[in-house]
Interface confidence: low
């Protein structure tokens, strides 16, 4: 997250860091009680690596007792999505168990009604992605609120040049922006999750370049269809 | 038209506690921080902390943290901040203010209350 | 904490001159610097964010600049109306900090 701040502790009992070998790689959002929801692209050079799901943490390295590591079960990604495009870029990880719930675990409502958030929207974005250009990683969860793009402005040419269809929502990116290592994580509008991280190589911070996030309105139906 | 309407003067005997109010009109309440800012002659401005209106969280100033509590009530789109074991060096001007997003994201403390003056005295 | 030094807590002008107002950060705060000007008896208000851009309505007279630890907030040609304190406040890391003021007086 560049130009947020550190998050209040365990306010975002949602928060998933998708972690790759004991290491955090990804954001993720806990959307039902054994299933966390990512970015497909995260587990693209996962290839024999052990993918776990930390739920319950504010800081990645210190003891907190609601911390708990999972096991995947299964992941689950989209079927249509692929390495080199930034479309369907989603992914269902299946927990080991049931997560355990409490004041710092939670799962986050979905929204299921597929219609544009508002332009100008203020949504909140989380992650343990980097706080700068020089790659700092963060050891506590960062956040920022970001106003909502209309997808006209984020498809003019300057911008994402017509990559932003239907099924993506856009948020400004003027030195506050989500970034490396926040892909998979949740933007929350109004409390509900509206979009998730897209996983490509950005660049952060810079306005003509805003962040990208897969609409989860548009996926309702496949989401449904991995949790039944 | 954004307003930020706060509450008027207090008088307070040394020790006691004072709870002042900030209410906001014209734009989404729960969807900007709001500050909390102290003017005293003797040290200018000073950020005391801010409140997420929509979860609640707050950020102090190490400095304030024990002598101001923030809080809101979304119903009424109202911002509160507690002063609690008051003494003359509490006697200012407390300022709340809000950021605001002008379509390139964060501006400054775009918006100020007007200013509620608290003063402390046996 | 980072500290925003304001040097001059007085500067004395004409109407019409050029002014320059000084604010130096205690470490690079990466341009996220804003101006604030209080005139007596009012809350402050906002003129300059990000060091270097406008706030709507504020008068192009008005121009702010800097990076790294030194800013300035530039009036071109000040008019009698600007008579006031300014501020320059930090919005890099918190807690927000702000410079001491200075005050602007016209000869």
């Known amino acids: 997250i560049l130009g947020g701040r550190e998050a209040e502790a365990h306010a975002r009992p949602y928060m998933a860091s998708v972690q790759l070998n004991g290491a955090h790689l990804c954001g993720g959002v806990l959307v039902a009680e054994q299933w966390v929801l990512s970015a497909a692209h995260c587990l693209e050079d996962a290839a024999d690596g052990k993918v776990q799901v930390l739920l319950g943490a504010h800081s990645l390295s210190q003891p907190e007792p609601s911390k708990r590591l999972y096991d995947v079960l299964r992941a689950v990604p989209h079927p249509d999505s692929q390495p080199d495009t930034i479309d369907h870029d989603l992914l269902l990880l299946q927990l080991s168990e049931k997560a355990t719930l409490g004041p710092a675990v939670r799962p986050l409502p979905w929204q299921r009604v597929d219609r544009d958030v508002a332009p100008g929207t203020l949504c909140d974005v989380a992650g343990w992605g980097i706080v700068n250009h020089a790659g700092r990683r963060p050891d506590s969860l960062q956040h920022v609120l970001l106003p909502v793009l209309d997808r006209a402005t984020c498809n003019r040419r300057t911008h994402h040049d017509g990559a932003i269809t239907e099924r993506l929502m856009c948020a400004e990116s003027n030195r506050r922006d989500s970034c490396k290592g926040d892909s998979g994580g949740p933007l929350v509008c109004g409390g509900v999750l509206e979009g998730v991280v897209t996983s490509g190589s950005r660049v952060c911070g810079n306005r003509k370049k805003p962040g990208i996030y897969t609409r989860v309105a548009s996926y309702a139906a496949w989401i449904d269809s991995v949790l039944a | 038209e954004v307003q930020l309407q706060q509450s008027g003067p207090e008088l307070v005997k040394p020790g006691a506690s004072v709870k002042i109010s900030c209410k906001a009109s014209g734009y989404s309440f729960t969807g900007y921080y709001m500050n909390w800012v102290k003017q005293s002659p003797e040290k200018s401005l000073e950020w005391i902390g801010d409140i997420n209106p929509s979860t609640g969280g707050t950020t102090y100033n190490q400095k304030f943290k024990a002598k101001a509590t923030l809080t809101v009530d979304k119903s009424s789109s109202t911002a509160y901040m507690q002063l609690k074991s008051l003494t003359s060096e509490d006697s200012a001007v407390y300022y709340c203010?809000?950021?605001?997003?002008?379509?390139?994201?964060?501006?400054?403390?775009?918006?100020w209350g007007q200013g509620t003056l608290v003063t402390v005295s046996a | 904490d980072i500290v925003m030094t304001q040097s001059h807590k007085f500067m004395s002008t004409s109407v019409g001159d050029r002014v320059s107002i000084t604010c130096k950060a205690s470490q690079d705060v990466s341009t996220a610097v804003d101006w604030y000007q209080q005139k007596p008896g009012q809350s402050p208000k906002l003129l300059i964010y990000w060091a270097s851009t406008r706030h709507t309505g504020v008068p192009d007279r008005f121009t702010g600049s800097g990076s790294g630890t030194d800013y300035t907030l530039t009036i071109s040609s000040v008019q009698a109306e600007d008579l006031a304190l300014y501020y320059c406040q930090q919005h890099y890391s918190t807690p927000w900090t702000f410079g001491g003021g200075t005050k602007l007086e016209i000869k």
């Open positions: 203010a809000t950021p605001y997003y002008y379509g390139s994201s964060y501006v400054g403390f775009a918006y």
